[in-house]
């Protein structure tokens, strides 16, 4: 798993747009029924903000136990806290519910800095504002834990909705989301809108605000304008995908692509930041710095340390460029991009300067595990997890915090020539070389 | 080596402007690596940071003294100056000019301060 | 805001005798602090910076610790030139605005 503001311990060869316009994607293709259309008493169900991430609220067991639960693309366990923790409002007892089965089986996961611990089992689990379907899940109980809850978070466990692949402590333990589709007729899909604040929240706004929307089995109009564009899930372990290109404010980073997904690319709802490699992140940096260079900030903001601070109200959006990510696409040679702005990336933090500043935090880092599309990414778009048809989808969030300058996008197509080339194929172990 | 002086008058009416102008020497103000800074101690008190300037012209000033502060730079003549507006005797302090260094963020070099005094 | 509690306000030490100046944020600066020495009618004059490294012509015996909301300046062995007063200051908000109030350090 990764970690470096990697929630919830850690608080990741374009060829250039052409005049050629292949045939744009329609949503006009037939869908399943009940796929798309209104999930009314699943929208506003996620609270939480980027820098703790987003969670919805689930029942454990009978009678059942209500519990805060991180919203995670990037992981595939469902666990909770099932020992009292001094961060802990409450906790799963399994002791209490009727329904709980022990796979006399302990599990443990460690990352860079922390780790869990516990003991696997299954019991009846629900989402009060998701499908009205109940479902037996296999369930982490977190005995133990280092760095893992975050004081005030106000959520107690985690919903891991990748894949097996990379479930703990092996990949036949079944995730949530596979057993939610196998137990019930809800559609292989689920969509996600985060909504960033843009502006700093304090503990009672935060408890109080709606963080945005878990859609599960379908894809709400509401939440998006303009059309959604997919791009190929590469391999079912993270939610991997493919950049075929970046630009800093139209400018081509002119990397070999491969480098932006070196060893990987994935989309990440666990994960705050947009993390990239190491000489992407350089690079970046460098053509950031170069755009707003009528200001300089110190080099620990750059790293995602110090925060910059300005007068309420004046932060200079301006002078911060836009970023662009292009995304392989469905179609041979065609790419899209999805664009995102300093309100995405610039986190805003409260409570540490005057209550006349807007104090921010560069949320783009450094990462030694490839590129890692985070909440700062994911709250400017609408994000569908089209599990069924094996893609990821993309439009611009109905939420998202632009001025009256600059908007997010999702725009396509382009034409990108031997996109393939762009995936890094990660090294496999063999095996045989360990059995000494 | 570089250095700065700060200069002005020593003595402001109340309700008046306070002017002060800091001049670098040994060195260029149009450097990319520093930000400049004013800094003052009212006397037997401790440091308050007014604001900072960069050679381009952004500034950022002390929330609490923002309505009144202006901090200008003039690259020509390697100067970079204080104007605070509508003093009283609570702004009778020594006002230190200063560069910030180290990736922007410590005040590494400091002039030797000039005592301002507000008084009819 | 953050504020910095700097403590004790004086410190009455003879020469040669090791001094421990704190300074404690209100909330976590990481190791963007900064200490200042200023002696009587003169500018203050960087010493640490990032919490334990030594500006430059700094003698060895200043050294800084600390990270989070803890910090101490240590003078391992007091020469004469050394009383005066220190001063710490966050330079986790930027632009760096917040001083502590100070430490006399003073011959006993």
């Known amino acids: 798993t990764q970690h470096g503001i990697r929630l919830p311990l850690r608080s990741g060869l374009g060829g250039a747009p052409l005049g050629l316009r292949l045939p744009r994607e329609t949503d006009e293709e037939p869908e399943e029924p009940g796929r798309r259309g209104s999930f009314v008493e699943m929208v506003d169900n996620l609270r939480g903000k980027s820098g703790q991430g987003y969670y919805v609220e689930m029942t454990v067991g009978s009678p059942p136990q209500t519990l805060n639960i991180l919203v995670d693309t990037g992981s595939s366990n469902f666990a909770v806290g099932a020992a009292p923790h001094p961060f802990l409002h409450r906790y799963y007892q399994r002791q209490l519910s009727s329904t709980y089965r022990d796979l006399r089986k302990g599990v443990y996961v460690p990352y860079t800095q922390g780790k869990w611990e516990g003991e696997l089992g299954t019991d009846l689990v629900s989402i009060p504002h998701g499908p009205n379907v109940t479902v037996r899940a296999n369930i982490a109980a977190i005995t133990e834990s280092d760095k893992f809850f975050i004081n005030g978070s106000n959520w107690e466990g985690i919903l891991g909705l990748a894949y097996a692949e990379i479930a703990r402590p092996d990949d036949s333990l079944e995730p949530f989301f596979d057993s939610l589709v196998k137990q019930t007729h809800v559609p292989n899909l689920f969509s996600l809108q985060l909504c960033g604040a843009g502006f700093p929240l304090n503990q009672s706004e935060v408890l109080a605000s709606v963080g945005g929307s878990m859609i599960i089995g379908g894809i709400d109009h509401s939440l998006y304008t303009g059309s959604l564009w997919y791009t190929p899930i590469r391999r079912e372990w993270y939610y991997e995908v493919i950049i075929v290109r970046v630009e800093i404010n139209g400018q081509d980073l002119k990397m070999d692509c491969k480098e932006y997904n070196y060893d990987k690319s994935i989309v990440d709802s666990g994960t705050t930041n947009l993390r990239l490699p190491k000489k992407v992140f350089e690079a970046a940096v460098k053509s950031i710095k170069a755009a707003s260079s009528t200001e300089k900030f110190p080099d620990g903001f750059w790293l995602g340390e110090q925060l910059v601070c300005w007068q309420a109200g004046t932060t200079p959006w301006n002078i911060f460029p836009v970023i662009s990510l292009y995304l392989m696409g469905e179609v041979t040679n065609q790419s899209f991009r999805i664009t995102i702005l300093p309100q995405q990336y610039l986190r805003p933090v409260e409570d540490v300067a005057t209550s006349q500043d807007d104090c921010y935090k560069f949320a783009i880092s450094q990462s030694s595990t490839g590129t890692v599309m985070g909440a700062v990414i994911m709250e400017g778009f609408y994000v569908v997890f089209d599990r069924a048809r094996k893609r990821i989808g993309f439009a611009v969030s109905a939420c998202h915090v632009h001025d009256e300058f600059r908007t997010a996008a999702v725009e396509g197509p382009f034409v990108t020539l031997d996109m393939e080339d762009c995936g890094y194929n990660i090294p496999q172990t063999d095996e045989s070389t360990l059995m000494t | 080596q570089l250095q700065l002086q700060e200069s002005g008058p020593g003595l402001v009416k109340p309700s008046e402007t306070l002017s002060l102008t800091c001049t670098v020497s040994?060195?260029?103000?149009?450097?990319?690596?520093?930000?400049w800074g004013w800094i003052r101690q009212p006397p037997g008190k401790g440091l308050e940071w007014i604001g900072n300037i960069y050679y381009s012209g952004s500034t950022y000033y002390n929330p609490s003294l923002k309505s009144r502060v202006t901090i200008s730079v003039d690259t020509s003549k390697n100067q970079f100056s204080l104007k605070l507006s509508s003093v009283t005797a609570a702004d009778t302090a020594v006002y230190y000019c200063?560069?910030?260094?180290?990736?922007?963020?410590?005040?590494?070099?400091w002039g030797r301060g000039t005592l301002v005094t507000v008084s009819s | 805001e953050i504020v910095l509690t700097q403590s004790p306000a004086t410190l009455s030490l003879s020469p040669g005798e090791r001094a421990t100046l704190s300074c404690r944020a209100s909330?976590?600066?990481?190791?963007?602090l900064a200490w200042f020495q200023q002696k009587p009618g003169q500018a203050p004059r960087l010493l640490i910076y990032d919490a334990s490294n030594r500006a430059t012509g700094i003698p060895a015996r200043f050294s800084g610790s600390g990270s989070g909301t803890d910090f101490t300046l240590t003078i391992s062995s007091l020469e004469p030139e050394d009383f005066a007063v220190y001063y710490c200051?966050?330079?986790?908000?930027?632009?760096?605005?917040?001083f502590g109030g100070g430490t006399k350090v003073e011959i006993k």
């Open positions: 200063a560069r910030l260094g180290h990736g922007y963020s410590y005040f590494d070099l």
């Open positions: 040994g060195g260029s103000i149009s450097s990319s690596s520093y930000y």
């Open positions: 909330q976590s600066v990481s190791s963007y």
């Open positions: 200051q966050q330079v986790y908000v930027w632009p760096p605005r917040t």
